[in-house]
Amino acid sequence: PSGLVTANITDSEALARWQPAIATVDSYVISYTGEKVPEITRTVSGNTVEYALTDLEPATEYTLRIFAEKGPQKSSTITAKFTTDLDSPRDLTATEVQSETALLTWRPPRASVTGYLLVYESVDGTVKEVIVGPDTTSYSLADLSPSTHYTAKIQALNGPLRSNMIQTIFTTIGLLYPFPKDCSQAMLNGDTTSGLYTIYLNGDKAEALEVFCDMTSDGGGWIVFLRRKNGRENFYQNWKAYAAGFGDRREEFWLGLDNLNKITAQGQYELRVDLRDHGETAFAVYDKFSVGDAKTRYKLKVEGYSGTAGDSMAYHNGRSFSTFDKDTDSAITNCALSYKGAFWYRNCHRVNLMGRYGDNNHSQGVNWFHWKGHEHSIQFAEMKLRPSNFRNLEGRRKRA
C-alpha cells in the first residue's frame, strides 16, 4: 500500500487512510504505538482503505505502520506519525453563584497539562480571560454584574497544545440583597421606583413585611411608616392597632410600632419627615432615630435635626408612645384622648401627625408646631426612615 495518512484526529481517536496495493491482497496489517503505550496490531480485509483507531491516549505521538499480506507474502511496510489532541477538562460547573461572584469547578483531563485558559463572557459582550496553574481545579469569579447571563469556557494547555473548550452557562443572582431588610437595600438591588416592596426583617425570609418605599426623596431608600393625605383613614386608634399597624400602604396608613422597633433594631436609622400644604413644602431629618420595644412602650429616640420644618420632634425625644387606652405621657390628662390621636406625647405635643385630619382647632389637627403652629392642620405628611449610612452604601454600589 502507499499514501498512508491520518485524519479526524481527536484526543482519543484518529482515522488511518491509505492507497491500496496494485495487486490484489488478502489483508492489511495495521499496528500503532506511542510513547509509554503498548503496540496494538489489527488485521483488516484486503479491500479496506481506512481504519478507525480508537482508545488512543491524549497528547501522545503515535507511529502508525501498515503492510499488505497475500498468502505467505508480505509487502514492505509504510509508516506515518501523528499526535493526538490534548483532551479537554471535564464537568465544568458554576456553583455558589451570587450577584457578583461565582465559583467555577472542573475535573482535569487525562493528559498532563501546563495550565488552563479560562474565558468568561457576559451577554453584553464583556470578555475576560485568565490563565491558571496546572494543579488548579476551581476558580472564583469576582466583580460580576448582578442579574447577568454568563458563558464560562475552559481549555487545557500543554506547551503549544490546546484542548477543545468546554463551557457552562450561568446567571448571577439579580439582587445584591436577596432578602432586603429595608428600602435602601431594595434600592441598591436596582429598584428605583417608589411603591410597594417586600422587605425581610433582619434579612430573614420568614420575616417578610410589605412596605411602601420612597425611592425619590433625597436619594430614596426610605421606608414610609406614616402617611396623611386625605383624612380617609381613622387615626384615633387603640394601642393594639398602633402596635400592629393599619391602613392602606398606598394611601393613608401607620406601619406599626412593632415593625418600627424591629426595623430600627437592625442598625442605625435616620428619620425624614416630609410636609406639604397648599403648595408649600418643608422637611425635617434626624440622623438618629429608633423606637424601643413593647417593654419600653416603644420609647422614641430622635436626635440630630436638620431641615426646613423646624425641630419639633426634640420635644418628644425619649418619650413612650401613648394612645387613648394606654396613657404613657407626662400630662395629668390623657394627651391622646385630649387631642384625638396618638404619638410619643409628653404634655402634650409639638408634633401631632396622627391627629384629626383637617381639624384647625388648637392642637387637634395634623400639626408640626415649628412649621404651621397648632392652629393649622397640615394637608400632607409622611414619616420615613432609612439607614444613617445610606450615602456610603449608595457610593459603594455606584463604584461597583
Epitope: A314, S330, A331
Partner: antibody, heavy 120, light 107 residues
C-alpha cells in the same frame, strides 16, 4: 456635677459693648439648648436669648433683638452673649441656663449669674 | 408674645398651711408650663415641668396641675425653707415668658 459659671459682667457706659461667657461642665454640652435669662434689681425674671444644641438656631426677646448676639463653642463647652448698644434698662443679673432639650424648652440648671450695670 | 399672669403677687402664709398659686396664660399652651423657686440672692431652681411633673429632688409637698390656659402650683404644707418667690414660665413658644412672680413670706 452639672455646673454653669458666668463671667464678663461689669460696669459699662450706655452705648458700649460687653461680652458675657458661660463655662459649662458635667454634661454633654452640644446635646442641649442654652439660654440667657436676666433679672433687673428687685424685679422678676426675663428670658433674653436662647440657642439650640447645634448652634444652628438662635432666639431673642424683642427687647434685645439686633443688639445682642448669642453664640456657643461646643468644642469649648462655652456659651456667649455679645451685648452691643447697651442701655440703662439692660442693667440686670444675667443668668446662664441649661435646657432639658436640644431646642428651647425648660431650664433645669442655672448658673449663679453675672452682674451687668449700664450707667454713665 | 404670650403673657403670663400670676396671682397673688404676695402671699403671707403660716408654716404648715396649704399654699396655692395660680398662673394664667394669655393663649392656649397645652401643658407647656414650668414652675421655678427663687430664694433671695440665689439662682432660680426648677420645681415643676410640663405643668405637673416634679423635678428630681424636689419634695413631694409641691405639686402642679392645669392645662390649656390655667395652671396651679400647690404646696401642701408650707415649710420654713419654702419661703421664696415662685415664677411660672411658658415653654410653648419663644419668647419664653415668665409670670411676674409670687412672693410667699411668713405670716
Amino acid at each position: 456635677e452639672v455646673q454653669l459659671v458666668e463671667s464678663g459682667g461689669g460696669l459699662v457706659q450706655p452705648g458700649r459693648s460687653l461680652r458675657l461667657s458661660c463655662a459649662a461642665s458635667g454634661f454633654t454640652f452640644d446635646d442641649y439648648a442654652m439660654h440667657w435669662v436676666r433679672q433687673a434689681p428687685g424685679k422678676g425674671l426675663e428670658w433674653v436669648s436662647g440657642i439650640s444644641g447645634s448652634g444652628g438656631s438662635t432666639y431673642y426677646a424683642d427687647s434685645v433683638k439686633y443688639r445682642f448676639t448669642i453664640s456657643r463653642d461646643n468644642a469649648k463647652n462655652s456659651l456667649y452673649l455679645q451685648m452691643n448698644s447697651l442701655r440703662a434698662e439692660d442693667t440686670a443679673l444675667y443668668y446662664c441656663a441649661k435646657d432639658i432639650s436640644a431646642v428651647p424648652d425648660t431650664f433645669d440648671i442655672w448658673g449663679q449669674g453675672t452682674m451687668v450695670t449700664v450707667s454713665s | 408674645d404670650i403673657q403670663m399672669t400670676q396671682s397673688p403677687a404676695s402671699l403671707p402664709t403660716p408654716v404648715g398651711d396649704r399654699v396655692t398659686i395660680t398662673c394664667r396664660a394669655s393663649q392656649y399652651i397645652q401643658g407647656f408650663l414650668n414652675w421655678y423657686q427663687q430664694k433671695p440672692g440665689k439662682a432660680p431652681k426648677l420645681l415643676i415641668y410640663d405643668a405637673s411633673n416634679l423635678e428630681t429632688g424636689v419634695p413631694s409637698r409641691f405639686s402642679g396641675s392645669g392645662s390649656g390656659t390655667d395652671f396651679t402650683l400647690t404646696i401642701s404644707s408650707l415649710q420654713p425653707e419654702d419661703f421664696a418667690t415662685y415664677y411660672c414660665q411658658q415653654s410653648y413658644s419663644t419668647p419664653q415668658t415668665f409670670g411676674q412672680g409670687t412672693k410667699v413670706d411668713i405670716k
